[in-house]
């Protein structure tokens, strides 16, 4: 807290400009009018204030707006945004995408801070859903943003927004998140033809059910092994050897290198060994010829 002292004669700030750079903290406190600061916030960004001086300027705004800053001030906070706490930001009502962009720009190149996370949360809640423009903006600044949301939060993403998602935006998503995103992507891309559809849907396939994988296997898609390894194990297990061969096309040879890893390992255990042998890859661990396979889960369901 800066001690309150009268502003020295001739030092009262008439505008926010370079002359304030060498003011001491108490001089800034005494000589800069908070209302003037609020109307000229855009100038603060261009002036090399120290972090100590920025603390004083923030304090002045806090006193002027105890209930939270108006958006006209928030939009021009610039580097002063880095001084805000999540508690400060929770008082704000940010509705303009331009304001969001301006503040994200200040934090550009850094990890998502608690301040930024709170800002985004406030913005999205205010909008009611994660629309395409917002998602475009957020993933441009934070490619991993989508995967930081809970499945519940992802459920508010409209299918139209899925067009903004790039493959790298899904790199850190877990199966629960892809379970929510996949149906939206399927809906968003439903009018595309086979090969174009597969290119777009590929990065969402970690959420695809068995029946959709079976359908893809009939379309000569040539899925690469990296995508196959990200598929849900429970969706892969029911696929036949022939279906997997069609799904992977020339990439089927890659199964040998992955035979000890999920989901390939678990899938092999469910296949007849003689069916696996037809691939000519030397895959081992299938069900020996002559053995009967009982699906106990099906039996329990019937009883």
């Amino acid at each position: 807290e800066v001690e309150k002292t009268a502003c020295p004669s001739g030092k009262k700030a008439r505008e926010i400009d370079e002359s304030l750079i060498f003011y001491k903290k108490w001089e800034l406190e005494a000589c800069v009018d908070a209302a003037l600061l609020a109307t000229q916030m855009d100038r603060v960004n261009a002036i090399p204030f120290t972090y100590e001086q920025l603390d004083v300027l923030k304090h002045k705004l806090d006193e002027l707006y105890p209930q939270g800053y108006p958006e006209s001030v928030i939009q021009h906070l610039g580097y002063l945004f880095l001084k805000m706490s999540p508690e400060d930001i929770r008082k704000w009502n940010v509705t303009s995408l331009e304001t969001l962009k301006a503040l994200l720009e200040v934090n550009k190149g850094h990890e998502m801070s608690p301040q930024v996370a709170t800002l985004i949360d406030r913005f999205v809640k205010g909008r009611g859903q994660l629309d395409k423009d917002t998602l475009d903006t957020l993933t441009a600044f934070y490619p991993g943003y989508l995967c930081s949301l809970s499945p519940e939060e992802l459920s508010s993403v409209p299918p139209s927004s899925i067009w903004a998602v790039r493959p790298q935006d899904l790199d850190t998503c877990d199966p629960r998140q892809l379970d929510v995103l996949y149906p939206k992507a399927r809906l968003a891309f439903q009018n595309m033809n086979g090969s174009e559809y597969f290119v777009k849907i590929q990065s969402f396939l970690g959420g695809a059910p068995t029946e959709d994988l079976k359908a893809l296997s009939q379309q000569n898609v040539s899925m690469d092994l990296a995508t196959f390894m990200k598929l849900r194990t429970d969706a892969v297990l029911p696929l036949t050897v022939a279906e997997v061969q069609k799904l992977l096309g020339p990439h089927v040879e890659g199964l040998k290198a992955e035979e000890r890893h999920r989901p390939v390992r678990d899938w092999i255990l469910r296949q007849r060994q003689d069916d696996l042998d037809t691939l000519g890859l030397g895959l081992q661990g299938g069900i020996p010829n002559g053995y009967l396979v009982l699906d106990l889960s099906m039996q329990e369901a019937l009883s």
């Epitope: 001739g10 370079e18 002359s19 003011y23 090399p48 120290t50």
Partner: antibody, heavy 119, light 106 residues
Framework: EFQLQQSGPELVKPGASVKISCKAS????????MNWVKQTNGKSLEWIGI????????SYNQKFKGKATLTVDQSSSTAYMQLNSLTSEDSAVYYC????????????WGQGTTLTVSS | QIVLTQSPAIMSASPGEKVTMTCSAS?????MYWYQQKPGSSPRLLIY???NLASGVPVRFSGSGSGTSYSLTISRMEAEDAATYYC?????????FGSGTELEIK
């Protein structure tokens, strides 16, 4: 121990440009503003400008606007001053100087870089 | 911009003698700063905020003043104090320095 280490002497031709460096050590580079000062003939000192290493924002003495450009590289804790369109009037010793807490004077100075502009 | 006039321009003092030099500002300033510079060396901060001694500066140095009139005093001159002394203000933008007082040892 705090230190501001400047680049060595420069001999350049009129019309050319030069970039002087000032490497900071012993303190958090981004916490303190950096200034540049010109000294001609071992006499008067003139303030050129100031830069905030945290945000890269800068301010210049009107006299040096268009002549000097201040930049920083946070990764190497180094401040730079580029001087362009050099003339013999620019021949001087140039210092970088850190501003102390709450604007308590230029508390640490570099050793100075001698610039000679001559054809 | 504020002009700082230092006087005298050159002075000499004997070891042990009290030395006072002044800095007059063309307009009122809040604080004055004083620097010492020896030949071939960088300036060194002596006094900040008019009267505060910078780190490592001997207590024989002191500063005072207000408004447009400031002074630097050395209570007892020592040989190592031979140097040029500059006053500086940044109450008004841009910061400016005085033209210096050259102090010699007798």
């Amino acid at each position: 121990e705090f230190q501001l280490q400047q680049s060595g002497p420069e001999l350049v031709k009129p019309g050319a440009s030069v970039k002087i460096s000032c490497k900071a050590s012993g303190y958090s580079f981004t916490d303190y503003n950096m200034n540049w000062v010109k000294q001609t003939n071992g006499k008067s000192l003139e303030w050129i400008g100031i830069i905030n290493p945290n945000y890269g924002t800068s301010s210049y003495n009107q006299k040096f606007k268009g002549k000097a450009t201040l930049t920083v590289d946070q990764s190497s804790s180094t401040a730079y001053m580029q001087l362009n369109s050099l003339t013999s009037e620019d021949s001087a010793v140039y210092y970088c100087a850190r501003v102390g807490r709450d604007n308590s004077g230029f508390d640490y100075w570099g050793q100075g870089t001698t610039l000679t502009v001559s054809s | 911009q504020i002009v700082l006039t230092q006087s005298p321009a050159i002075m000499s003092a004997s070891p042990g003698e009290k030395v006072t030099m002044t800095c007059s500002a063309s307009s009122s300033v809040s604080y004055m700063y004083w620097y010492q510079q020896k030949p071939g060396s960088s300036p060194r901060l002596l006094i900040y905020d008019t009267s505060n001694l910078a780190s490592g500066v001997p207590v024989r140095f002191s500063g005072s003043g207000s408004g447009t009139s400031y002074s630097l005093t050395i209570s007892r001159m020592e040989a190592e104090d031979a140097a040029t002394y500059y006053c500086q203000q940044w109450s008004s933008y841009p910061p400016t320095f005085g033209s210096g007082t050259e102090l010699e040892i007798k």
